[in-house]
């Protein structure tokens, strides 16, 4: 029982996993998207830089009211180090340059895919 | 939407220069890996030359190699084709492209003609 207490209590979870359930939440909202995504609202795009997961959840997080992304915004927390709230606008934000948060998270999924199979988990 | 919007075409004469700009909007640009293809009259479409997201990896068709040049700036969303040592044969119209093997990120641009021609 002593060697099992450690499967009883959850630790932290490894970056892959973090990752991969991220992946695999985002391919959710791709694949089970029927009517416009959050019904088609705009999110600043953003710069892919260090900083890129708060600066996706910068964006996301100004779009209320859309119960598809809310685990997204949730799973992104967990990535970016410090508290982010609506109204923000980091320097990983690209000014002027609003995409739609279907194609938004259609790109995430693309790049997290990418960084998932160089091993880039943090 | 998504859109890609090629410019720079024209007529130049043989040995001449041009330079193709592609400016991208409606996604997140500096996500995808992004090519140059190219149809000349009566021809099938050949795929000129490709360059990663992060723009240190190039690829080039023997046809171009040594002469033609990719390259991108994510900051302006825009993907760049340099044209140099141009030949008749280079006649075509230019199609900016997204070069993703995932299904889905598949994108291109209306094309730009280049005429190469004394």
């Known amino acids: 029982l002593t060697c099992l207490g450690g499967f009883a209590s959850p630790g932290p979870v490894p970056p892959s996993t973090a990752l991969r359930e991220l992946i695999e939440e985002l391919v959710n909202i791709t694949q089970n998207q029927k009517a416009p995504l959050c019904n088609g609202s705009m999110v600043w795009s953003i710069n892919l830089t260090a900083g890129m997961y708060c600066a996706a959840l910068e964006s996301l997080i100004n779009v209320s009211g859309c119960s598809a992304i809310e685990k997204t915004q949730r799973m992104l927390s967990g990535f970016c180090p410090h508290k982010v709230s609506a109204g923000q606008f980091s320097s990983l934000h690209v000014r002027d340059t609003k995409i739609e948060v279907a194609q938004f998270v259609k790109d995430l999924l693309l790049h997290l895919k990418k960084l998932f199979r160089e091993g880039q988990f943090n | 939407g998504v859109q890609l919007l090629e410019s720079g075409g024209g007529l130049v004469q043989p040995g001449g220069s041009l330079r193709l700009s592609c400016a991208a909007s409606?996604?997140?640009?500096?996500?995808?890996?992004m090519g140059w293809a190219r149809q000349a009259p009566g021809k099938g479409l050949e795929w000129v030359s490709s360059?990663?997201?992060?723009?240190?990896?190039?690829y080039y068709a023997d046809s171009v190699k040594g002469r033609f040049t990719i390259s991108r700036d994510n900051s302006k969303n825009t993907l760049y084709l340099q044209m140099n040592s141009l030949r008749a044969e280079d006649t075509a119209v230019y199609y900016c492209?997204?070069?993703?093997?995932?299904?889905?990120?598949?994108?291109w641009g209306q094309g730009t003609l280049v005429t190469v021609s004394s």
């Open positions: 492209a997204t070069a993703e093997d995932e299904p889905g990120y598949d994108y």
């Open positions: 409606g996604f997140i640009f500096a996500v995808y890996d």
């Open positions: 360059i990663n997201d992060g723009g240190n990896v190039t």
